[in-house]
Amino acid sequence: ESGYAQNGDLEDAELDDYSFSCYSQLEVNGSQHSLTCAFEDPDVNTTNLEFEICGALVEVKCLNFRKLQEIYFIETKKFLLIGKSNICVKVGEKSLTCKKIDLTTIVKPEAPFDLSVIYREGANDFVVTFNTSHLQKKYVKVLMHDVAYRQEKDENKWTHVNLSSTKLTLLQRKLQPAAMYEIKVRSIPDHYFKGFWSEWSPSYYFRTPEINNSSGEMD
């Protein structure tokens, strides 16, 4: 193999910090999996840098990542999903830094979607429902969800509820009357697969009813 950088380039490169992090998404596009890596230092000069993964692949020994702006990614069916892969930052044939990673331990689920809140007048509660693409997946099916909600005026005062289903009931008496609330949800692998929180779903906004003066209950 060939393709070495100039010596000066390598000497400069060795002064930099090439720490990176990666996450995998399984069956993210039909049966295709993806692997995304990025440098932790956003100021790294990535001009001649490439990422390569070797080992725990089905059809080839190594694969090169594709570069899009400052992220590097692979989308393929060819991850074995058993054992560790070696992911390296390379200049030509020289490896600047490498990590041995089991792709099943860096899974980032897709964000939940279709979040909605319905008020049930008779029950005096709010039913929160959302959807996740993972219900249809072969691999990462079991997730823990984190539902976070806040009164719109309380910028950093989020209340979090963890659940394994896609339905949650919020009691009316636990919420402020006549208030606007924001709610959102994210997911993390919860069985066999390990990894990171998904992105948050788009927020949903709902208003709680006013208190009915005669009964002390919300309208």
Partner: antibody, heavy 122, light 107 residues
């Protein structure tokens, strides 16, 4: 449609140099690894070189390493093979080939040029 | 370096018969194997990749099997246009390598 057209072949003396070109059309060259593969008269296929989609990595067998250099100019939709210190055993039809899969490096080839003949003889 | 061995070197078959071509590798290449057909004066044509996936436009009478180090290309019922040279190629690792070829000729 996808087309690969090689040029630059010819008769050269042992020790001489030649530069092959491959003009591509019908696809985005920068998305693909590209390769040169050769076939000596009456013989089988022999892989000569591969270049990654970015052009940052190149690969050669021992038989040509240090003598041949693969390069690409995505803006000109062209792939090149610079051949130095040519030997009689380099005589072959040289094919430019594109892998079926874009990116990453799955090197099986679904598009081939028609080939250009390189003859090394005194 | 992975060494590719194809057998037989020549296979004599009558039209309509089944042809079985073999390809062995010196190391485990999982399913990183392709098959090509080449006719005189033409460039090779991809038939099979991933050891058993039929390339688009290739007739279903062609099939590939095997994994690890032993692979087979089968032509279920030879047509006149199938008489050609067939090559296997490993793309599991560099250096990429082709087998020596099997010539399928009319019996």
């Amino acid at each position: 449609q996808v087309q690969l057209v090689e040029s630059g072949g010819g008769l050269v003396k042992p020790g001489g140099s030649l530069r092959l070109s491959c003009a591509v059309s019908g696809f985005t060259l920068s998305d693909y690894y590209m390769a040169w593969i050769r076939q000596a008269p009456g013989k089988g296929l022999e892989w000569v070189s591969t270049i990654s989609a970015s052009g940052l990595r190149t690969y050669y067998p021992d038989s040509v390493k240090g003598r041949f250099t693969i390069s690409r100019d995505n803006a000109k939709n062209s792939l090149y093979l610079q051949m130095n210190s040519l030997r009689a055993e380099d005589t072959a039809v040289y094919y430019c080939a594109r892998p079926m899969s874009a990116h990453y490096g799955f090197n099986y080839f679904d598009y081939w040029g028609q080939g250009t003949l390189v003859t090394v003889s005194s | 370096e992975i060494v590719m061995t194809q057998s037989p070197a020549t296979l004599s078959v009558s039209p309509g018969e089944r042809a079985t071509l073999s390809c062995r590798t010196s190391e485990d290449i999982y399913n990183g194997l392709a098959w090509y057909q080449q006719k005189p004066g033409q460039a090779p044509r991809l038939l099979i990749y991933s050891a058993n996936s039929l390339h688009i436009g290739i007739p279903a009478r062609f099939s590939g099997s095997g994994s690890g180090t032993e692979f087979t290309l089968t032509i279920s019922s030879l047509q006149s246009e199938d008489f050609a040279v067939y090559y296997c190629q490993q793309y599991y690792d560099y250096p990429l390598a082709f087998g020596g070829g099997t010539k399928v000729e009319i019996k």
